[in-house]
Interface confidence: medium
């Protein structure tokens, strides 16, 4: 999916109102330093692309993200926001339902909701001064 | 590793064209705005022009404006600048350069190539 | 257009600050970026949005910017940081990058 056409502006809200801060619920107990950054991203579609792959597409060690509260309202953001995303996403949304729920918290998975909150970061990020 | 590699670049008399290419690795080409900067023998830094990351904006210098056109394929991981009606005053080393684009193009330069160079004589 | 003015050499000796101006009108309000470049080298991005320092930037490299000024501070300066040093800008009146003359640091 192409993310060049999504509302920047909205999902940059819906991150600082609610997926923000269940992104840190999910990290609680984690220090902040204890994991590297080794994701990153170079402009907002980028960082949208990598979100989504970071947050939706299991990886080793962590298949268990898509389930989480912070992944339901991704979800649902980019599917608000980002025109003809949702219509992208069903295969895959019925791929999921098809994997077994499984409510682990590896550290992997803690590494890799680190990695997204630094991309999530990124996305957001704050324009110093206005130019 | 990420690497920026100029090549086009070498002797032609005034009036004439050249065009510089750029090739990108080990990195996302096409997420980054990418610029020509130009340094004259024992000048300063130049800006010479900008191409978003999807090649829907340009933006040149005063000096070339009219002369140099920037462009990219982000197929090919290539940036180019064809320069045309040139000027003894465009003798010089010409880098291309990678920025991140996040708020139009108010981004610091993270990444050079090692440049290539243009001498303009009759 | 926009201009900002560097002094075009700063001396300073082993071990101690040298401290690097950028001047430009209300430079304070854009972001400014610093790069080094030695001899025969490509520049090197050494600071950017005013203050923030790539990971391989040794910590002695700082910035501030504020007003009419901008400055790239290195503290315990050594002979390999020996080099032009140029600041540079976004000017959003003109679309344009803008950099300085750049400054020649000497360590003596």
């Known amino acids: 999916y192409d993310f060049t056409n999504c509302d920047f502006e909205k999902i940059k809200a819906a991150y600082l109102s609610t997926i923000s801060k269940d992104l840190i619920t999910y990290m609680s107990g984690t220090k902040s330093t204890e994991f590297n950054n080794t994701v990153s991203c170079s402009n907002r579609p980028h960082c949208l692309t990598e979100i989504q792959s970071l947050t939706f597409n299991p990886t080793a060690g962590c298949a268990s993200l898509a389930k989480e509260m912070f992944a339901m309202k991704t979800k649902a953001a980019l599917a608000i926001w980002c025109p003809g995303y949702s219509e992208t996403q069903i295969n895959a949304t019925q791929a999921m339902k098809k994997r077994r729920k499984r409510k682990v918290t590896t550290n992997k998975c803690l590494e890799q909701v680190s990695q997204l909150q630094g991309l999530w970061r990124r996305f957001n990020r704050p324009l110093l001064k206005q130019q | 590793q990420m690497q920026l590699v100029e090549s086009g670049g070498g002797v032609v008399q005034p009036g004439r064209s050249l065009r510089l290419s750029c090739a990108a690795s080990?990195?996302?080409?096409?997420?980054?705005?990418m610029h020509w900067v130009r340094q004259a023998p024992g000048k300063g830094l130049e800006w010479v022009a900008v191409?978003?990351?999807?090649?829907?904006?340009?933006h040149y210098a005063d000096s070339v404006k009219g002369r140099f056109t920037i462009t990219r394929d982000n197929s090919k991981n290539t940036l180019n600048l064809q320069m045309n009606s040139l000027r003894a005053e465009d003798t010089a080393v010409y880098y291309c350069?990678?920025?991140?684009?996040?708020?139009?193009?108010?981004?610091?330069?993270?990444?050079w190539g090692q440049g290539t160079m243009v001498t303009v004589s009759s | 257009s926009y201009v900002l003015t560097q002094p075009p050499s700063v001396s300073v000796a082993p071990g101690q600050t040298a401290r690097i101006t950028c001047g430009g009108n209300?430079?304070?309000?854009?972001?400014v970026h610093w790069y080094q470049q030695k001899p025969g080298q490509a520049p090197v991005l050494v600071v950017y949005?005013?203050?923030d320092r790539p990971s391989r930037i040794p910590e002695r490299f700082s910035g501030s910017n504020s007003g009419n000024t901008a400055t790239l501070t290195i503290s315990r300066v050594e002979a390999g940081d020996e080099a032009d040093y140029y600041c540079?800008?976004?000017?959003?009146?003109?679309?344009?990058?803008?950099f300085g003359g750049g400054t020649k640091l000497t360590v003596l």
């Open positions: 949005d005013d203050s």
């Open positions: 209300l430079i304070g309000a854009k972001l």
């Open positions: 080990g990195f996302a080409f096409r997420t980054y705005g």
């Open positions: 191409i978003w990351y999807d090649g829907s904006n340009t």
């Open positions: 350069v990678r920025a991140p684009q996040w708020y139009l193009s108010a981004e610091a330069f993270d990444l």
């Open positions: 540079q800008v976004w000017d959003h009146s003109s679309d344009h990058v803008v």
